[in-house]
């Protein structure tokens, strides 16, 4: 199986009550605007076939996509939470910049691509859904990377 390196985040990143609260508030506000509750982006299909040691690398890909393709285009919305949460998530992304796996990551890219395709297919409502799942992104990053 591919070996992951530098795929770790310090626990302290997730022990800051203020930014944790702001992230969850942002997710709550966006999910109240999400009318497509049948679809879940961060769920079993995303992680299927991915080993424990690869989970953080997968979440790095999801985090980067969320920052670049979802949060930046929607940066004017959901204030004041957005202006605080985006820099926090960007710091986490930066911390994972050296997170790689040695070997084939095609199965991971396939899973992440399905998430990306779902968001793109749903258009703006897909972006809102992704923001509404920032609580799951936060927790999944934590669980996979600490």
């Amino acid at each position: 199986a591919p070996v992951s390196s530098h795929c770790r985040l310090d626990k302290s990143n997730f022990q800051q009550p203020y930014i944790t609260n702001r992230t969850f508030m942002l997710a709550k506000e966006a999910s109240s605007a999400d009318n497509n509750t049948d679809v879940r982006l961060i769920g079993e299909k995303l992680f299927r076939g991915v080993s424990m040691s690869e989970r953080c690398y997968l979440m790095k890909q999801v985090l980067n996509f969320t920052l670049e393709e979802v949060l930046l285009p929607q940066s004017d919305r959901f204030q004041p939470y957005m202006q605080e949460v985006v820099p926090f998530l960007a710091r986490l992304s930066n911390s994972l910049s050296t997170c790689h796996i040695e070997g084939d990551d095609l199965h991971i890219q396939k899973n992440v691509q399905k998430l990306k395709d779902t968001v793109k297919k749903l258009g703006e409502s897909g972006e809102i859904k992704a923001i509404g799942e920032l609580d799951l992104l936060f927790m999944s990053l934590r669980n996979a990377c600490i």
């Epitope: 080993s51 424990m52 669980n143």
Partner: antibody, heavy 119, light 112 residues
Amino acid sequence: EVQLVESGGGLVQPGGSLRLSCAVSGFSLSSYAMIWVRQAPGKGLEWIGIIDIEGSTYYASWAKGRFTISRDNSKNTVYLQMNSLRAEDTAVYYCARDRFVGVDIFDPWGQGTLVTVSS
Amino acid sequence: AVQLTQSPSSLSASVGDRVTITCQASEDIYTNLAWYQQKPGKAPKLLIYWASTLASGVPSRFSGSGSGTDFTLTISSLQPEDFATYYCQASVYGNAADSRYTFGGGTKVEIK
């Protein structure tokens, strides 16, 4: 339909060994981690260990050294090898699929197989 | 290792009653908590995960809440098929892998 069926339980003497099997159907075993959990008569659930997709294993501290989990994806089967069995190992042993959704959840479970350790 | 304390250990209730079961963790487990239902002689069945997300096929009378150290499972209107034992389960990451998964002691819901 997703199914897990445990087998191999029975009566064994203290100090003896037993190998339990968990045969799965309705899903691709190679895509999931699998866990073993036990339940002593009238007691609660106790995690034994987990085997990851690529075969890495992690055990509860009390199970290390005596219990070994393995898998054979080609046979759609997960195993629990139990050695140096004691009376307190008497329990129903369950296997379950680990569905990671950002957090580990165990679903579904097999029906269990009873192991009785007694002389 | 995290300890999960469920209360009460047993309770008697009638059909139609609102039932609340609590699970207290000895350390912060965020929302990494699941609830399982087990009927006599049967395997456990997943009810709730992420502390409050209903598993597929689970009736909406079941709900979960809480985060950190205090969690609650509520059955809004108890049905005959709900008489069972309920277990909470925590997943803990970043510590030793030998204590990653922990179950509470269980709460038995009996007919009054």
